[in-house]
């Protein structure tokens, strides 16, 4: 049994880091493998992660952490029974993938303005809380070409757009994702999408 693709890990910078790797053949990850992880700290102890299958030869493990600070470093040991298959380390602050925003809501009762709001996925005491920026994706269910991205570079989790920038009388969907420049993170996953019917009064034509 050998590791074909070494574990790579990303952290949500809150409580979970996810590590993925590939074995050289079909593997029952949860029965055959264990990933031991330990914070490099005098009084820490090793924790065991039981991996799950992620495709035939792929494995994924969700490492639980109390919290994360920038100085944290973890040692990782991948075991198959008594055999050490791979040894490495992981610094969560250098491999951050933020949590996805939630509770995306489209408010259509503001006159001719669409107000999209969502929730910051972090609690106020987390470092990323004040460092997230967002991308909002809006697309038409009827027209695949009607697909747009709005970059929200301010901290407030909301976006206002004129309803008239979208076609009237058809249904749209929106979703949002986050990233943090301070840690050069990857983008989060997209939030669940939300749907609404876009309708607004056309202005009277002047003749």
């Amino acid at each position: 049994m050998k590791v074909l693709q070494e574990p790579t890990c990303v952290s949500d910078y809150m409580s979970i880091s996810t590590c993925e790797w590939k074995m050289n053949g079909p593997t029952n990850c949860s029965t055959e493998l264990r990933l031991l992880y330990q914070l490099v700290f005098l009084l820490s102890e090793a924790h065991t992660c039981i991996p799950e299958n992620n495709g035939g030869a792929g494995c994924v493990c969700h490492l639980l952490m109390d919290d994360v600070v920038s100085a944290d470093n973890y040692t990782l040991d991948l075991w198959a029974g008594q055999q050490l298959l791979w040894k490495g380390s992981f610094k969560p602050s250098e491999h951050v993938k933020p949590r996805a925003p939630g509770n995306l809501t489209v408010h259509t009762n503001v006159s001719d303005t669409l107000l999209l709001t969502w929730s910051n996925p972090y609690p106020p005491d987390n470092y990323l809380y004040n460092h997230l920026t967002y991308a909002v994706n809006i697309w038409s269910e009827n027209d695949p070409a009607d697909f747009r991205i709005y970059n929200v570079t301010y901290l407030e989790p909301s976006l206002r757009i004129a309803a008239s920038t979208l076609k009237s009388g058809i249904s749209y969907r929106a979703r949002v994702r986050a990233w943090a420049q301070c840690y050069n993170t990857t983008w989060s996953e997209w939030s669940p999408s939300t749907k609404w019917h876009n309708s607004y009064r056309e202005p009277f034509e002047q003749h």
């Epitope: 700290f41 005098l42 009084l43 820490s44 102890e45 109390d66 600070v69 920038s70 100085a71």
Partner: antibody, heavy 116, light 111 residues
């Protein structure tokens, strides 16, 4: 709410023994390392000993090595410090502290006086 | 003799910004993070800053920490009379498998 309550302090003669206890509540005791820190009257803080969450690893300051023993009972949510061969210079308030990277919660302390 | 050196005293007037230093000896390993504790008169110490610059919840943002090599600093801005206390720095020394604490700095708020 995290609470740490030390007990077992008192007056003891040089060469004598005492056992300090620290009762923990408000958090999952078995998931945290713990430590003892002391403060002699009018002096600064001095780290004494620390123990990992399972008790697998234990560390002592040179000044108490071989005389003090730290232990824990996770089923009772209690930390202990057995102090033998006590000296006058061990006179101090002894604090129990929870460890999360640093000493993030402290008890109110128990006074140990070593005097003849 | 502590391997972390702090000035024995510091002072400032209300509203001022005060900085307390904590210096490791030249041979002190610089891999560990610094922590800061506040001890108000007659009370148990309280964690103020951990991992160089992180504040536990409930600690006002007037308190901030920084690290440079084997030294650290605690800054208190908008000084208040209730900040009058002893301040200690500390760090894990992995070469000695121990926790080392500075000698403490007594902060006096004047006026």
């Amino acid at each position: 709410e995290v609470q740490l309550l030390e007990s077992g302090g008192g007056l003891v003669q040089p060469g004598g023994s005492l056992r300090l206890s620290c009762a923990a509540s408000g958090f999952t005791f078995s998931r945290h390392a713990m430590a003892w820190v002391r403060q002699a009257p009018g002096k600064g803080l001095e780290w004494v000993s620390a123990i990992t969450m399972s008790g697998r690893s234990i560390y002592y300051a040179d000044s108490v090595k071989g005389r003090f023993t730290i232990s824990r009972d996770n089923s009772k949510n209690t930390l202990y410090l057995q102090m033998n061969s006590l000296r006058a210079e061990d006179t101090a308030v002894y604090y129990c502290a929870r460890v999360h990277r640093a000493f993030d919660y402290w008890g109110q302390g128990t006074l140990v006086t070593v005097s003849s | 003799q502590s391997v972390l050196t702090q000035p024995p005293s510091a002072s400032g007037t209300p509203g001022q910004r005060v900085t307390i230093s904590c210096s490791g000896s030249p041979l002190f390993p610089d891999s560990g993070s610094f922590n800061w504790y506040q001890q108000l008169p007659g009370t148990a110490p309280k964690l103020l800053i951990y991992a160089d610059s992180h504040r536990p919840s409930g600690v006002p943002d007037r308190f901030s920490g920084s690290k440079s090599g084997t030294s650290a600093s605690l800054a208190i801005s908008g000084l208040r009379s209730e900040d009058e206390a002893d301040y200690y720095c500390g760090t894990w020394d992995y070469s000695l498998n121990s926790y080392v604490l500075g000698g403490g700095t007594k902060l006096t708020v004047l006026g």
